[in-house]
Amino acid sequence: GSTVPPMVNVTCSEVSEGNITVTCRASSFYPRNITLTWRQDGVSLSHNTQQWGDVLPDGNGTYQTWVATRIRQGEEQRFTCYMEHSGNHGTHPVPSGNSHHHHHHHH
């Protein structure tokens, strides 16, 4: 089938002790091969500081996955979710302020 670029959505959830969990979700993409990773100041975080979900079919012939990491509250602007899929790539910031959702479709 033809390439379907992912929809990327970044969310934050509050956790204790001044830390937050940021989650980057990629959905509705095809084929299933994708790179999704968190970067701090433009550098990929080491694997042991990130959690990945499996790449799973979403029932529409496309796929979905996610990656999450825990960061210090107030440092959100230093972190981005980096996505590579079928030769395309994109960088997605952590939402700032009161906005806890950010999504973008790659073309």
Epitope: Q40, D41, G42, V43, L45, N48, R78
Partner: antibody, heavy 119, light 108 residues
């Protein structure tokens, strides 16, 4: 002003060890990623190691992996490079560099400290 | 690892000449993670162009950078004496970070 001052270089025998230090001043050290970059005499630049602000992301060049250890002491504003099993090809000027958080890249460099590995 | 190949290795240029050097990556990298440094003999390198096309503070406007994917370049529109130096490209798209082998620019 940002200042990075390396120390600890000198003559080391093959197979020996050496610990380099980089004293940082003029910026909030504990919020910046740091690196070591080296340059052999009359050769090009070679990135050696990276450590992020919280010391939980560390990367090494393949040529030094398993022999060199990068670390930092944030309260003392100091970056370290512990070098073991040194070889003649490790002879180089070692630069401490600060990572640029907004754009990436090495925005500030020290003057370097020379490590010579020779019998 | 991503290998950066710079060409030419050496360039002898006349004053006022346009100078272009290239940096070719062994696999595609994001333009956000490609930078250039200038180094003169006996001195530490300086960040010269960041994120492919942005001039670092104090860099003259005769310098420019461009590129995407696997192909990047640095151009000096009109060569001046102070531009004689070695220029290195560098990527942090993927660890291990790497430098190109450099392009040495001299005055003819």
């Amino acid at each position: 002003d940002v200042h990075l001052v390396e120390s600890g270089g000198g003559l080391v025998q093959p197979g020996g060890s050496r610990k380099l230090s980089c004293a940082a001043s003029g910026f909030t050290f504990n919020t910046f990623g740091m690196n070591w970059v080296r340059q052999a005499p009359e050769k090009g630049l070679e990135w050696v190691a990276y450590i992020n602000s919280g010391s939980n992301t560390i990367y090494y060049a393949d040529t030094v992996k398993g022999r060199f250890t990068i670390s930092r002491d944030n309260p003392k504003n100091t970056l370290f490079l512990q070098m073991t099993s040194l070889r003649s090809e490790d002879t180089a000027m070692y630069y401490c560099t600060r990572w640029e958080p907004v754009t990436g890249g090495f925005s500030y460099w020290g003057q370097g400290t020379l490590v010579t590995v020779s019998a | 690892q991503i290998v950066l190949t710079q060409s030419p290795a050496f360039k002898s240029s006349s004053l006022g000449e346009r100078v272009t050097m290239t940096c070719t990556a062994s696999s595609s990298i994001s333009s956000s993670y490609l930078h250039w440094y200038q180094q003169k003999p006996g001195s530490s390198p300086k960040l010269w162009i960041y994120t492919t096309s942005n001039l670092a503070s104090g860099v003259p406007a005769r310098f420019s950078g461009s590129g995407s994917g696997t192909s990047y370049s640095l151009t000096i529109s009109t060569m001046e004496a102070e531009d004689a130096a070695t220029y290195y490209c560098h990527q942090h798209h993927r660890s291990p970070f790497t430098f190109g082998s450099g392009t040495k620019v001299e005055i003819k």
